[in-house]
């Protein structure tokens, strides 16, 4: 019979012969032949390999360095790499989060609309009219003026995105 | 075809060295372990060593030290660098394809440790 | 070092006897052995590998079992070409290393 140009899913051609692959979590020893099939080794302790695969060495797990704020999210196994993420009030800088940075906190004036994870950074926004903040904080959304009528106040000062209002008593010398 | 064939064997003296070699056809040693294992005269099979693809190697407790097994992938050879050899090292010395599926294997060469 | 215990070491049977020859391993190694059969003067042949399987071209009434630290190869009904001496062959999972049993000769009762 001709020699195979081409092999099914999970194997591959290698001397004009089709053979399986490496299943995850294995890397190659030795090729098939006509009489034997594919020989695979499992990954050592800290390996792995996530793909059907013709690998001669498996991949280190990543390590999660704690001196750059890491730690680990996620176990790896012999199929799956080590997940990473940062320490509490920290974040990734990248995806694949190879470093942390602190988080982020709000400048008065800024309330935190989304609040950061060990992944994503702060998110700020700008306190609208009606609202405020008057701390730098990575936690504090703005908060509304405090409302004088209710109170039975009156605006002595008029608040800004980093002040509340200030209220008064009511001027009781009206005609 | 598949083939290996090992040379480097001969008459050689207590404490001496001798290193064989294993040339290999047939097949890429880019992705194949090869083993290196012993017969002495009218005894059982011994395994020496390995050496994977990846290019780390293996020995058997005795063997450490003493021999190492290195490779040249241009030339598609292996190496058995033998060190300090014994009497007790005389022995038909095979190598083979695999770990623990060795189907291929050469026909050996004797080494001989006498004075 | 892996041990890998072989018995018996000889065997004295007859054309058509059913023999075995089992194998012990010092520590468990999953299925990672493998059978050989050897005739003076020559290499060993590849009869069983991963325990159970044979290599295609070997005749069927070689059969191999077992898994952890104890096998058994069964020749079914030996033929005068099976007079030969045989050895299992196990090894560590992580690659670290074989050994090979004492072998085991099958010789003509």
């Known amino acids: 019979p001709e020699p195979p140009t081409a092999c099914r899913e999970k194997q591959y051609l290698i001397n004009s012969q089709c053979c399986s692959l490496c299943q995850p979590g294995q890397k190659l020893v030795s090729d098939c032949t006509e009489f034997t099939e594919t020989e695979c080794l499992p990954c050592g302790e800290s390996e792995f390999l996530d793909t059907w695969n013709r690998e001669t060495h498996c991949h280190q797990h990543k390590y999660c360095d704690p001196n750059l704020g890491l730690r680990v999210q996620q176990k790896g196994t012999s199929e799956t790499d080590t997940i990473c993420t940062c320490e509490e009030g920290w974040h990734c800088t990248s995806e694949a989060c190879e470093s942390c940075v602190l988080h982020r906190s709000c400048s008065p004036g800024f309330g935190v609309k989304q609040i950061a994870t060990g992944v994503s950074d702060t998110i700020c926004e700008p306190c609208p009219v009606g609202f405020f903040s008057n701390v730098s904080s990575a936690f504090e959304k703005c908060h509304p003026w405090t409302s004088c009528e209710t109170k039975d106040l009156v605006v002595q000062q008029a608040g800004t995105n980093k002040t509340d209002v200030v209220c008064g008593p009511q001027d009781r010398l009206r005609a | 075809e598949v083939q290996l064939v090992e040379s480097g064997g001969g008459l050689v003296q207590p404490g001496g060295s001798l290193r064989l070699s294993c040339a290999a056809s047939?097949?890429?040693?880019?992705?194949?372990?090869i083993s290196w294992v012993r017969q002495a005269p009218g005894k059982g099979l011994e395994w020496v060593g390995i050496?994977?693809?990846?290019?780390?190697?293996y020995y058997a407790s005795w063997a450490k030290g003493r021999f190492t097994i290195s490779r040249d992938n241009s030339k598609n050879t292996l190496y058995l660098q033998m060190n300090s050899l014994r009497a007790e090292d005389t022995a038909v010395y095979y190598c083979?394809?695999?770990?623990?599926?060795?189907?291929?294997w050469g026909q050996g060469t004797l080494v001989t440790v006498s004075s | 070092d892996i041990q890998m215990t072989q018995s018996p070491s000889s065997v004295s049977a007859s054309v058509g006897d059913r023999v075995t020859i089992t194998c012990q391993a010092s520590?468990?190694?999953?299925?990672?052995l493998a059978w050989y059969q050897q005739k003076p003067g020559k290499a060993p042949k590849l009869l069983i590998y991963?325990?159970?399987t044979l290599p295609s071209g070997v005749p069927s009434r070689f059969s191999g079992s077992g898994s952890g630290t104890d096998f058994t190869l069964t020749i079914s009904s030996l033929q005068p070409e099976d007079f030969a001496t045989y050895y299992c062959?196990?090894?560590?999972?992580?690659?670290?290393?074989?050994?090979f049993g004492g072998g085991t000769k099958v010789e003509i009762k």
């Open positions: 083979a394809r695999g770990y623990t599926t060795l189907y291929f």
């Open positions: 047939g097949f890429s040693l880019s992705s194949n372990a």
């Open positions: 050496i994977y693809a990846s290019g780390d190697t």
């Open positions: 062959q196990g090894g560590y999972s992580s690659g670290a290393g074989t050994a």
């Open positions: 991963s325990a159970s």
């Open positions: 520590e468990s190694i999953s299925t990672r």
